[in-house]
């Protein structure tokens, strides 16, 4: 290993700010990739990494292209992937990522799905459908032209699917309220049966959201199909057209036919033989996680390593598993000392600094490098759509036809033990998705199932129950749940969406934008009730006052969690109230706080940790 001129941070609680985002990945995936990349170093050295929301951060993370505000311009697709500055003030310590790259998890473009039966899981490329391999979304097996993909490697075996971003599901911005395109539609007296750039000079594809634009003037922009946007060839930035004809044969996905190098390509018109328009299909992309882990190594003071297996080696290669080599560990520990592993039993209180958790032992990722082998020199730059960044996505309510089938719609009664995906026994669950007190019983949610814990002798534990039977609109994975003690309405949160149940009636999903929470808030960790009609809403180390009636946060009220609750983990993933105490969960553990919810003003003497324990042993009373 080599260090950089002896430079290192003079403190061990490092802060970082994600200044902007790439369009290649959903924001929550980008947040997660960076958090995991920091955690790699936090695992082996006594460093903590706290996300903050301003330029006072030690490490400012930025996506940029070409000349982007420093003296070290990027170079377009491939080549230089990212760069970082050594520790210090100002731009020193910052990490910049070249947004002309395709950022992924290292295994191809990440396409979120809608509807279907996979709860928004990303497409898995390639996937097999009816014995054929697909490397992009397809309309095969459907007669309505809506592109879909499998969310596992084999649709034929698993039957898991979702719909790809498509104008047949929704449009973005414009004035069509996010409604899908209506095809055909009339524009300037002419009929259009696909998105068009006609009438625009900026090249954005749009459509009418009614049958007649000339009459109704309602429109939206068509979502970008990143899975099918070609690079290189003679049509860079255009979309693959499926099916297309090549040498008289029809292709419904990218192919390497006709090439000796095995690279996948597609036609950008329906007939290559006549039009000769083509481009390369998106490649595997670069793992944002691994490139970031490498760059953060630089930002912490490590120079390049001469050990080819090291994360800090200057060449990019694909890798799965924990990315650090002994040389990397020696280097970071030379700078900051050896890391101490946490005690299996949690301490009575914890600091307010982040305690990064270990990354998964097998993460689909790759290590970074400054100069990988050069691929196509031209790549789409991806023009941003005009208007706001979030877009509603209403879609078809009916079940999809021939291709993948929708899951059966379940009844709304609590159905007890059917075949369960987690363990039948909640005592075997490491970390629950969400815990909440609902109708006097503590509910433990995991992977689309839940258990009820009634705090009395006899048989206190009931379940498992299928979440979708009791609350039909909910996704399988929840971040948190909360019952309003006054109205008994139940709030559920998953990602950037919220559902509110009054009995069996649901309102939602609603975007967190509607609550007054900006795009940097990627999930809600929990709510704690306050005085009448008010609550505290938590997310990633911050807390807001929340009006349960208007369902809005007070944006001026945001403060750090440790300002009101000292000694709880800053990155608690689930926060709930039970028997008039507040519980902050992190990993297998909870931190219990004596919480005064009647008073208007927080009593700092009261909001103190009074117990730390195991969720399973101490709350669920597992043996």
């Amino acid at each position: 290993f080599q260090t950089f001129k002896g430079l290192k941070w003079d403190h061990h609680n490092i802060t970082y700010w994600i200044q902007n985002y790439s369009e290649d990945l959903p924001r929550d995936m980008i947040d997660d990739a960076f958090a995991r990349a920091f955690a790699v170093w936090g695992e082996v050295a006594p460093l903590t990494f706290t996300r903050v929301y301003g330029p006072e951060a030690d490490i400012v993370i930025q996506f940029g292209v070409a000349e982007h505000g420093d003296g070290y311009p990027f170079d377009g697709k491939d080549g230089l992937l990212a760069h970082a500055f050594p520790p210090g003030a100002g731009v020193q310590g910052d990490a910049h990522f070249d947004d002309d790259e395709l950022w992924s998890l290292g295994k191809g473009v990440v396409i979120p799905t809608y509807y279907g039966n996979s709860n928004g899981a990303p497409c898995h490329f390639p996937f097999t459908f009816e014995g054929r391999s697909y490397s992009a979304c397809t309309t095969d097996g459907r007669n309505d032209g809506t592109p879909w993909c499998s969310t596992t490697a084999d649709y034929d075996k698993d039957g898991k699917f979702g719909f790809c971003p498509s104008e047949r599901l929704y449009t973005e911005h414009g004035n069509g309220e996010g409604k899908p395109c209506v095809f055909p539609f009339i524009f300037e007296g002419r009929s259009y049966s696909a998105c068009t750039t006609k009438g625009r000079s900026d090249g954005y594809r749009w459509c009418a959201t009614t049958a007649n634009y000339d009459q109704d003037k309602l429109y939206g922009f068509c979502p970008t199909r990143v899975d099918a946007t070609v690079v290189g060839g003679n049509s860079a930035g255009e979309l693959c057209v499926f099916p297309f004809v090549f040498l008289g044969k029809q292709y419904s996905s990218c192919t390497s036919d006709g090439r000796r190098d095995g690279r996948l390509w597609c036609a950008t018109t329906s007939n290559f033989d006549t039009d000769k328009k083509w481009g390369f299909c998106p490649d595997q992309g670069y793992s944002l996680f691994l490139v970031a882990a490498h760059e953060f190594g630089h930002a912490l003071g490590l120079d390049h390593s001469s050990v080819p297996e090291a994360l800090m080696y200057p060449l990019y290669s694909y890798l799965e598993g924990f990315p650090l080599n002994k040389d990397d560990i020696d280097g970071i520990q030379y700078l900051y000392g050896r890391g101490s592993k946490p005690d299996p039993r949690p301490p009575a209180t914890t600091t307010t600094e982040p305690q990064p958790t270990a990354p998964p032992t097998m993460c689909p990722t790759i290590p970074p490098t400054a100069y990988p082998t050069v691929g196509p020199t031209v790549g789409p730059t991806g023009a941003p759509s005009p208007g706001p960044t979030s877009s509603p996505s209403p879609g078809p309510t009916g079940a999809p036809s021939p291709g993948p089938t929708a899951p059966p719609t379940a009844g709304s009664s609590e159905a007890s033990t059917e075949s369960l995906s987690p363990a039948d026994n909640p005592c075997n669950v490491d970390v629950f998705d969400a815990i909440a007190e609902i109708q006097g019983a503590l509910h433990f949610f995991k992977d689309g199932w839940y258990w009820k814990f009634l705090n009395h002798r006899g048989s206190p534990l009931q379940g498992p129950f299928l979440t979708a039977r009791t609350w039909p609109a909910l996704p399988a994975t929840l971040d948190s749940a909360f019952e309003d003690p006054q109205t008994k309405r139940v709030f559920f949160f998953s990602g950037r969406q919220m559902w509110v149940y009054t009995g069996k009636t649901v309102l939602g999903p609603r975007s967190l934008d509607k609550l007054g929470l900006g795009p940097e808030v990627t999930h809600v960790s929990g709510l704690l009730p306050r005085r009448l009609g008010k609550a505290l809403l938590f997310s990633k180390g911050r807390v807001w006052r929340f009006d349960l009636k208007s369902q809005k946060v007070d944006p001026q009220s945001v403060i750090r969690v440790d300002k009101e609750f000292s000694g709880v983990p800053w990155n608690s993933h689930d926060i709930f109230q039970y028997q008039d105490k507040a519980y902050f969960c992190h990993g297998k553990f909870f931190w219990r706080v004596s919480f005064q919810n009647e008073v208007n003003k927080v009593d700092h003497e009261v909001n103190q940790v009074d117990d730390v324990g195991y969720v399973t042993y101490d709350l669920l009373q597992c043996p």
């Epitope: 505000g69 003296g71 170079d75 050594p86 200057p314 490098t369 400054a370």
Partner: antibody, heavy 124, light 107 residues
Framework: EVQLLESGGGLVQPGGSLRLSCAAS???????PMWWVRQAPGKGLEWVS?????????FYADSVKGRFTISRDNSKNTLYLQMNSLRAEDTAVYYC?????????????????WGQGTLVTVSS | DIQMTQSPATLSLSPGERATLSCRAS??????LAWYQQKPGQAPRLLIY???YRATGIPARFSGSGSGTDFTLTISSLEPEDYAVYYC?????????FGQGTRLEIK
């Protein structure tokens, strides 16, 4: 020992062309950005052009954009500057220089090795 | 482009004296500044990189300081071989730019 050796300078008429070469040795040429810097007689230093290691990205001063082309052949450890449509104000000693910074760690600022320079005179 | 202004244009000092050369950037460049020495008929030689780090083989009498917009090159005790033209160069923003130079001459 690191060495940079420029060649290809000389006298040329306005509108003419020249191709400068810079032969590098003593370091891993393919890892480093390379630069051309010029100095008009009795004047200061002026950046002309630079190229990234793979050759995939090139940069030019406004005064030469569209007329000069920088390139490199990593297999020959050689840097080039093709100069077309030369003007009298292009008269200078042209130096090639090696960047201290390489790869994605951008703290090293400065050109740690320079060639001895080659004189380009544009005159009728 | 960032303008780099060096002062004074000429500095006349005797051997053994302390020389202080100044370089000012038109906007902040953090510590992305290098100093070069150039003698007649020779190529420039890197003295200081990143504002304060001596390049390989540079004597300890040369030191650099400063951050942001104001930078100084100091030669603690002038030796006969130090008389030359000194240039500063920034890389805090693109494109890189050089100062116009300070001529250090024997008094």
């Amino acid at each position: 020992e690191v060495q940079l050796l420029e060649s290809g300078g000389g006298l040329v008429q306005p509108g003419g062309s020249l191709r400068l070469s810079c032969a590098a040795s003593g370091f891993t040429f393919s890892l480093y950005p390379m630069w051309w810097v010029r100095q008009a007689p009795g004047k200061g230093l002026e950046w002309v052009s630079s190229i990234y290691p793979s050759g995939g990205a090139t940069f030019y001063a406004d005064s030469v954009k569209g007329r000069f082309t920088i390139s490199r052949d990593n297999s020959k450890n050689t840097l080039y500057l093709q100069m077309n449509s030369l003007r009298a104000e292009d008269t200078a000693v042209y130096y090639c220089a090696k960047d201290r910074a390489y790869g994605d760690y951008v703290g090293w600022n400065g050109f740690d090795y320079w060639g001895q320079g080659t004189l380009v005179t544009v005159s009728s | 482009d960032i303008q780099m202004t060096q002062s004074p244009a000429t500095l006349s000092l005797s051997p053994g004296e302390r020389a202080t050369l100044s370089c000012r950037a038109s906007q902040s460049i953090s510590s992305f500044l290098a100093w070069y020495q150039q003698k007649p008929g020779q190529a420039p030689r890197l003295l200081i990189y990143d504002a304060s780090y001596r390049a390989t083989g540079i004597p300890a009498r040369f030191s650099g300081s400063g951050s942001g917009t104001d930078f100084t090159l100091t030669i603690s005790s002038l030796e006969p071989e130090d008389y030359a033209v000194y240039y500063c160069q920034q890389r805090g923003n693109w494109p890189i730019t050089f100062g116009q130079g300070t001529r250090l001459e024997i008094k």
